[in-house]
Structures are given as structure tokens and as C-alpha cells.
Interface confidence: low
């Protein structure tokens, strides 16, 4: 007796995947079915790859579900001005088949940028500076050539925005230098985007402070005492006179009498702490100490130097 042995399996790879039409966010594809391996093809899935993706990724299509008798579909939700290639995968009740060979590579068309820079912030810098920073927009979200940033800022509470155009996709920092910038003053800041197609949106407005002025007055009433052969305690008072420049902490400098001051060691305190302990010193040694206030702009003038000798070991 004769018998036919039919071996059913997942479909073979579809063939001739073609990009028929491409816009800024869509691509219309067509393909030919491969062998169904004796089990009807029930659906197709489309995958895409770009220079920015990790391997092949499934993409959204219209129709959302592509049945086995449909050989065209529109891929939606693509990023403008990105080079894409596509492939299709067929499936039947037995399983998912091998993917087709990739289509040709095609770039989507340009569009206005839509993604704003992340983490707009700033601060610091030198006197009379407003430093503004942000995270650059990834290339795949720039939506076109000629990408750049528009930095807008104004003193907090003022009406008029000052604008600066940075025609570089890599820009992530802008420094406004002007003698009228008062130390540690609040500014409203936002960063917008543009490309050859035009201007996109601005980031949400955030408040950034201009650069501080370093403390202008020295700490007062410096006093030091030996606690042991290895430890000294230093005390001081915040500046007596009105000090310009916020004080973030104090820097205590100490050096042995036989050493040069430029070889001094430094320790920093944080906040309004006005004493500190210096440890790991040598016994019966004369030390010189001085204290300065500091903030993000730098250190202020030094206090008078005081002397203290550690106890005998």
C-alpha cells in the first residue's frame, strides 16, 4: 500500500521584503510568502533594525495583526531621519519560522524635533556667570539634520527671555557671562530644540542659580589646643563682618613649623560647624593652623595663623 508522509513545520522565510513608501514616521512594506511547510501561514510579524537599536525589534503596524493572507503592511511610530531596515517573520500553528532577508536600508524623512533635553540644570561657574547644562537629545530623536539648541533664560520674576542659539547637536552646556549677573541669583531657564525643519518645544522651566561669589571675609577668633600627642582641636567663629558669598563650610589648613606652608594639609568641614579635630599628628611638634570659609565659587581669605604644640608622647 502506498502512503504519503507529510512533514509539517514552521513556515520558511518570506521573500523580497520591499519598502514601497516611506514618510517621517511610517514605512509601507510588501513581501512575498515563503513556503508554508504544509501548514497554512496564520500571521506575519514585522521587525526593524536601526543603527541605534540592539538587534531586531518588533514594530507596530497597520493592520495591528497581519494575517497569513496579507502581504503588505504599514509600519508606524518610526523616528524621523533614522535609517531603518525591515524583515518579516511568518508563523503557523506549528511555530514561528525563520526571518526573511533584510530589506534595503532607507531613511525616514525629516520632521520637527519633538523631544526636549533632559535634566536641564546648572549653577556653579565663576563670578558673573550663569552656567546652564542639559543632557543632549540622542541622535535618533533629533528628527533631522541641522539639530541644535535654543537656551532661554531670564532673571527670576522678569518678563523677557534672553535667547541664545547653539547650532550644535553635541552642545550640553552654555555659560552666560555678564558683569550684571549678581552672585547666587535665581534665573528661570529652559532649553528648546530645532533642526532644519524648524523649532521644536522647550523643556519645562527650571530655576538655576548664577555663580556664587567666594566668601569675602575671614573666620574670626581662631583658637587651637592640643588634646594629646596626636590630636589637636581647632575652634573658630563665622566672619564677624557682613560676608558676601554663602558659606558652605570651612577649610582648615595645618603644617609643621619646619615645613613650608605650601605643603600644608587641608581638611574641610561642611555646614556651620565651627570646630574640628585634627588627628594622626606627631608628638611634641609645633603646628601652624589657619581657617578659610568656602563655597562652590572657592575659598575666602584666610584667618590669622595660630600655633599649637602637640603634647609629649
Amino acid at each position: 500500500a502506498a502512503a504519503d508522509l507529510i512533514v509539517r513545520g514552521p513556515p520558511g522565510p518570506p521573500e523580497a521584503v520591499t519598502i514601497d513608501e516611506i514618510t517621517d514616521t511610517t514605512a509601507q512594506l510588501s513581501w512575498r510568502p515563503g513556503p508554508d511547510n504544509h501548514s497554512p501561514i496564520t500571521m506575519y510579524v514585522i521587525q526593524a533594525r536601526t543603527p541605534f537599536s540592539v538587534g531586531w525589534q518588533a514594530v507596530s503596524t497597520v493592520p495591528e495583526l497581519i494575517d497569513g493572507k496579507t502581504f503588505t503592511a504599514t509600519v508606524v511610530g518610526l523616528n524621523p531621519w533614522v535609517e531603518y531596515e525591515f524583515r518579516t517573520v511568518a508563523a503557523n500553528v506549528i511555530g514561528i519560522g525563520e526571518p526573511s532577508r533584510p530589506s534595503e536600508k532607507r531613511r525616514t524623512e525629516e520632521a520637527l524635533p519633538e523631544v526636549t533635553p533632559a535634566n536641564v540644570s546648572g549653577g556653579g561657574g565663576s563670578k558673573s556667570e550663569l552656567v546652564i547644562t542639559w543632557e543632549t537629545v540622542p541622535e535618533e530623536l533629533q528628527n533631522g539634520r541641522g539639530f541644535g539648541y535654543v537656551v532661554a533664560f531670564r532673571p527670576y520674576g522678569k518678563m523677557i527671555w534672553m535667547l541664545t542659539v547653539l547650532a550644535s547637536a553635541d552642545a550640553s552646556r552654555y555659560v552666560f557671562r555678564n558683569e550684571s549677573v549678581h552672585p547666587f541669583s535665581p534665573f528661570e531657564v529652559k532649553v528648546g530644540v530645532f533642526n532644519n525643519k524648524g523649532e521644536g518645544p522647550f523643556s519645562p522651566t527650571t530655576v538655576v542659580y548664577s555663580a556664587e561669589e567666594e566668601p569675602t571675609k575671614p573666620p574670626a577668633s581662631i583658637f587651637a589646643r592640643s588634646l594629646s600627642a596626636t590630636d589637636i582641636e581647632v575652634f573658630w567663629a563665622s566672619p564677624l563682618e557682613k560676608n558676601r558669598g554663602r558659606i558652605q563650610g570651612y577649610e582648615v589648613k595645618y603644617w609643621r613649623h619646619e615645613d613650608k606652608e605650601e605643603n600644608a594639609r587641608k581638611i574641610r568641614t561642611v555646614g556651620n560647624q565651627t570646630s574640628t579635630k585634627i588627628t594622626n599628628l606627631k608628638g611634641s611638634v609645633l603646628y601652624h593652623l589657619a581657617v578659610k570659609a568656602y563655597n562652590s565659587a572657592g575659598t575666602g581669605p584666610s584667618s590669622a595663623t595660630v600655633n599649637v604644640t602637640t603634647r609629649k608622647p
Epitope: 532673571p155 520674576g157 518678563m159 555678564n178 558683569e179 549678581h182 541669583s185
Partner: antibody, heavy 123, light 102 residues
Framework: AVTLDESEGGLQTPGGALSLVCKAS????????MFWVRQAPGKGLEYVAE????????WYAPAVKGRATISRDNGQSTVRLQLNNLRAEDTGTYYC????????????????WGHGTEVIVSS | ALTQPSSVSANLGETVKITCSGS???YGWYQQKSPGSAPVTLI????NRPSDIPSRFSGSGSGSTGTLTITGVRAEDEAVYYC?????????FGAGTTLTVL
Amino acid sequence: AVTLDESEGGLQTPGGALSLVCKASGFTFSSFNMFWVRQAPGKGLEYVAEISGGGGSTWYAPAVKGRATISRDNGQSTVRLQLNNLRAEDTGTYYCAKSADTWSYGAATIDAWGHGTEVIVSS
Amino acid sequence: ALTQPSSVSANLGETVKITCSGSSGSYGWYQQKSPGSAPVTLIYDNTNRPSDIPSRFSGSGSGSTGTLTITGVRAEDEAVYYCGGYDGSTDVFGAGTTLTVL
């Protein structure tokens, strides 16, 4: 002593343009914001425009926004107000004023005034 | 806009207080003796008095209110007094307070 001298305003025609210049002396001009303030006949003081010491920042009152331009020449110690598309309600005395601090947050910081110049907008 | 009384009166030698409200920043106080004459700055930034201004003029600011105080008012103090400040959107002056010395 600080002195601020405004140029003559005079009679202007509606729809025309006004240019006022203020010459400053007696202080480090580039370090201070400058203002133009005006007073209509029988009315109170009205803030018009402000410019920062370096000239990079300008602010305008709503009544003149889009019509006014304030600028400065730190080399010549002058500040200029250009007011276009003049209206009858622009009539008044225009004062040049100096901010009290190197970074001014509003008219509250004026510490010196010019003598004022009269502007009449009439056909 | 900034709000200040339209008029106040005082006898010679009395203390006068003129208030101003509506500023989100500091206040300044300006004296104008006749319309069209240049204003004179009495107080800037709430409390600072220019060196050529008599000490009988003083200023204070608390919250959203600024106050100009004239201690021992004189006949020559008769004038219109303007406050200046920032109303949250623009720099503004009050409508002015006329001081009459009796």
C-alpha cells in the same frame, strides 16, 4: 556726583518714531542697570524700559512692548530709548534713571534721576 | 499695580507713615514736589537711604508691605510720594500719595 542728562523730546507726530538719549556721568556706567520712566500730564510715574549693565538684558512695560527698544553704549556712557508707532498716550515727561545696585530687580532700586524731557505726541 | 493711599495729612512735627502693598520684591520711595519735576529717591530696596536724604525719612518692608516713615514732618515735605516695586509681572509704581502738611 551722578548726573543724567536726557536729550530734547519735543513735538512728535502720531505714528512716528521717538529717539531719546541719556548721557550719564559720575559713576561706573557699565556696572549699573538703567531705566526709562515716564509721567503723562496729571498722572503718576510709569516704568517704560530697563537695560542691564552689559546691555545683554532688556525689559519693557506692557504698554510699550513691541514698540520700544532700549539700548546702551558703555563706551559713550549713553542709554537710548527708541519708541515707534507713537500714540497720543505716549505724551509726557520722560526720565532717565539709574539703578542703585549692579543687578536690579525692578524700579524699587532707582537711586538717581535725570531732569526729564517733555515729549508731546500730536498732529 | 501697587496700592498706596491717595492722600495723607499731618501737622508740623508729627510722624507720618505711608504704606504700599502689592510688590513681590523690595520697595523704593520717591518724592515729587511738582508734576514734571524730577522725582527724588528717598529710599531704595526697602530701607536704604541715599546719603543726601535727611534722616527723618526711613523705610521698612515686611512681607508684601512697604512703609515710608517721615519723622517730624516739615512744611517742605509737602509733595507727592510714589512707591515703586515689582508686582509679579512687571516693574510698577503706585499711583502716588499726596502729603498735605497742616
